[in-house]
């Protein structure tokens, strides 16, 4: 697991920066739990970070994760609703310089390695579609999110919007 | 562009179901939550509950057990059922769209006109 | 539940004061705050989201700032047009409380 400190002190560095050209409305230093109180956490092996989704004991300390928030426009000829819209975008980086990734090829979610700006399978649709809880879907494959999947986070086809509060794809963002 | 209306009955009994009806336009109701919130006469804004963009629905704890919502996608309508009603629900009642698609961390940019419900005998 | 309480509950000012409503959370709500203004009436109108976002369309007169648990609405210099009432709000967690209000009236 990362130590706490260096997250905090990389959030400070990160408020002095930017990502993608334009800076995040807000972060939030978090631990990612399933909709089943699993806790998610990082761990280096072998020089890469592997993602455990795993029930902790009862003192152990969850891991935390950076979430800067984007705000996005999404234009009226995109969105279907002859309006323009504003969606929210997350980045989820457990420690410095390392953010999630989406990997459509293999429906993998990893950690990789970044420099600045983030390419587009870093960023993340917020949702909150469930009391209390959010889901990532996938800025590069829509339809796609963040899912749990045998004890791993794995990427998962959401057919449609009545299966958007399957358990297997909803989290939950904690200080503690 | 976008536009929500409340109607329903302006005078309704008590210990009867108060029913209001949301009708939208200019957005779609499967990328954006709708909420309700009430403001009685004279006093402030109380949040009643949210239709979620993937249908699911959070409600106010403390009016959980009376009530409601529900949405009819074909017509682009959000309902609202408050059953057991007394004079405390004597209220304006508006119904709202959040700012962001999915999501609503960002607020309530457009509102309805609100609609006056007495509970009166 | 998370309570939002906001203070003052009102305050007398004249055109061109400073005014600063407060807004404390009971539990911390990250950014996940909103300002709105109301006039008799009137339906309430967003002006800040996500706690110093301004929305669109708001004069720049107004700004927010806080996060956390502790929250600020500044109006830097009071417009005939200011005197209303403002909420803030909590979207964090649902239920999506909001606070008491503070009427902003004329001295």
């Known amino acids: 697991a990362f130590g706490i400190s260096g997250v905090q002190k990389y959030t400070r560095a990160l408020h002095d920066s930017s990502i993608t050209g334009i800076s995040p409305i807000t972060e939030y230093l978090a631990s990612l739990s399933t909709y089943n109180d699993q806790s998610i956490t990082f761990a280096l092996e072998d020089e890469s970070y592997e993602i455990y989704v795993e029930d902790l004991k009862k003192d152990e300390k969850k891991d935390k994760v950076l979430l800067s928030y984007y705000e996005s426009q999404h234009p009226s000829n995109e969105s279907g609703d002859g309006v323009d819209g504003k969606m929210l975008m997350v980045t989820l980086s457990p420690t410095k310089d390392f953010w999630l990734h989406a990997n459509n090829k293999e429906h993998s979610v990893e950690l990789h390695k970044c420099e600045k700006p983030l390419p587009d399978q870093a960023f993340f649709v917020l949702h909150n579609m469930h009391s209390n809880c959010v889901s990532f879907e996938c800025k590069t494959d829509p339809g796609v999110f963040i899912g749990v999947k045998d004890n791993h986070l794995a990427l998962i086809k959401v057919d449609s919007s009545e299966n958007l509060c399957t358990e297997n794809i909803l989290f939950k963002l904690s200080e503690t | 562009q976008v536009q929500l209306q409340e109607s329903g009955p302006g005078l309704v009994k008590p210990s009867e179901t108060l029913s209001l009806t949301c009708t939208v336009s200019g957005f779609s109701l499967s990328k954006y939550g709708v909420h309700w919130i009430r403001q009685p006469p004279g006093k402030g804004l109380e949040w009643l509950g949210v239709?979620?963009?993937?249908?699911?629905?959070g409600y106010n704890s403390a009016l959980m057990s009376r009530l409601t919502i529900s949405k009819d996608s074909s017509k682009s309508q959000v309902s609202l059922k408050l059953s057991s009603v007394t004079a405390a629900d004597t209220a304006v009642y508006y119904c709202v769209r959040d700012h962001y698609y999915y999501s609503s961390y960002g607020g309530f940019v457009y509102w309805g006109q609100g609609t006056l419900v007495t509970v009166s005998s | 539940d998370i309570q939002m309480t906001q203070s003052p509950s009102s305050v007398s000012a004249s055109v061109g004061d400073r005014v600063t409503i407060t807004c404390l959370a009971s539990?911390?709500?990250?950014?996940?705050l909103a300002w709105y203004q109301q006039k008799p009436g009137k339906s309430p109108k967003l002006l800040i989201y996500a706690a110093t976002r301004l929305a669109d369309g708001v004069p720049s007169r107004f700004s927010g700032s806080g996060s956390g648990t502790d929250f600020t609405l500044t109006i830097s210099s009071l417009q005939p047009e200011d005197f209303a009432t403002y909420y803030c709000q909590q979207l964090d967690s649902s239920p999506y409380t909001f606070g008491q209000g503070t009427k902003v009236e004329i001295k």
């Open positions: 539990q911390t709500i990250g950014a996940w």
């Open positions: 239709l979620r963009a993937g249908g699911s629905t």
